[in-house]
Amino acid sequence: EQAPGTAPCSRGSSWSADLDKCMDCASCRARPHADFCLGCAAAPPAPFRL
């Protein structure tokens, strides 16, 4: 996973300064107040791969 300022997190994830790594936006359902969830709201979620 990338440090901020290098490359963005992959689609469907967002950078967590608290954890110092990219985190899954899907986890914001259970952890809506996590620091990285603000970054998830700004981007569309990853699509399903059916």
Partner: antibody, heavy 119, light 111 residues
Framework: EVKLQQSGGGLVQPGGSMKLSCVAS????????MNWVRQSPEQGLEWIAE??????????HYAESVKGRFTISRDDSKNSVYLQMNNLRPEDTGIYYC??????????WGQGTTLTVSS | DTVLTQSPASLVVSLGQRATISCRAS??????????IHWYQQKPGQPPKFLIK???NRDSGVPARFSGSGSGTDFTLNIHPVEEDDTAIYYC?????????FGAGTKLELQ
């Protein structure tokens, strides 16, 4: 490297007590929900307890099968999680794993410790 | 509680062939954006190892031979091509609600 080192377990008589411990390293322990999952031939993999974060006053959740008998606790200063098991029954026999999850999946597991409840 | 039913209970596959494991949930475990199903591999004498999160996302270090798919109530783990090291029991798990439950497992053996 993430590591969950477990201790405790062994043979205990029905009605007896046992405490399991798990020491974590290699990740930001205080941000993770800590869990105990047990495994037996009869029940397969069975989640039994979870403790969440200090910021929410350490809420806990238990499987119905252990509610009122088992207590999960954690000490963030020691990167440790515990499972106090009272009034043990033969059906509590199995391998006990501590496991961490941020929210959804159990990404790291301890090595497991065996509990046998028998007279 | 959400019940996860895995099938088949056991599977014998030839080296290099495809293994397909099914996991069916007793209720939907998906939102419009994500599916809350995860997959694990367990070898004898070891704890489960996390493989795939949110139905289709491999953990870092998991070979591309492993792939997951599905939404709603029906999910699939595919392994192709199967290698000798893949002999193990595979479990699905949901995180839709408390309690998080596991499937009963599928034992994969090589012919």
């Amino acid at each position: 490297e993430v590591k969950l080192q477990q201790s405790g377990g062994g043979l205990v008589q029905p009605g007896g007590s046992m405490k399991l411990s798990c020491v974590a390293s290699g990740f930001t322990f205080s941000y993770y929900w800590m869990n105990w999952v047990r495994q037996s031939p009869e029940q397969g993999l069975e989640w039994i307890a979870e403790i969440r974060l200090q910021s929410n006053d350490y809420p806990t959740h238990y499987a119905e099968s252990v509610k009122g008998r088992f207590t999960i606790s954690r000490d963030d200063s020691k990167n440790s999680v515990y499972l106090q098991m009272n009034n043990l029954r033969p059906e509590d026999t199995g391998i006990y794993y501590c496991a961490c999850r941020y929210a959804d999946y159990f990404d790291h597991w301890g090595q497991g410790t065996t509990l046998t409840v028998s007279s | 509680d959400t019940v996860l039913t895995q099938s088949p209970a056991s599977l014998v596959v030839s080296l290099g062939q495809r293994a397909t494991i099914s996991c069916r949930a007793s209720q939907s475990v998906s939102t419009s954006d994500y599916s809350y199903i995860h997959w694990y591999q367990q070898k004898p004498g070891q704890p489960p190892k996390f493989l795939i999160k949110y139905a289709s996302n491999r953990d870092s270090g998991v070979p591309a031979r492993f792939s997951g798919s599905g939404s709603g109530t029906d999910f699939t783990l595919n392994i192709h091509p199967v290698e000798e090291d893949d002999t193990a029991i595979y479990y699905c798990q949901h995180s839709w609600e408390i309690p998080p439950t596991f499937g009963a497992g599928t034992k994969l053996e090589l012919q």
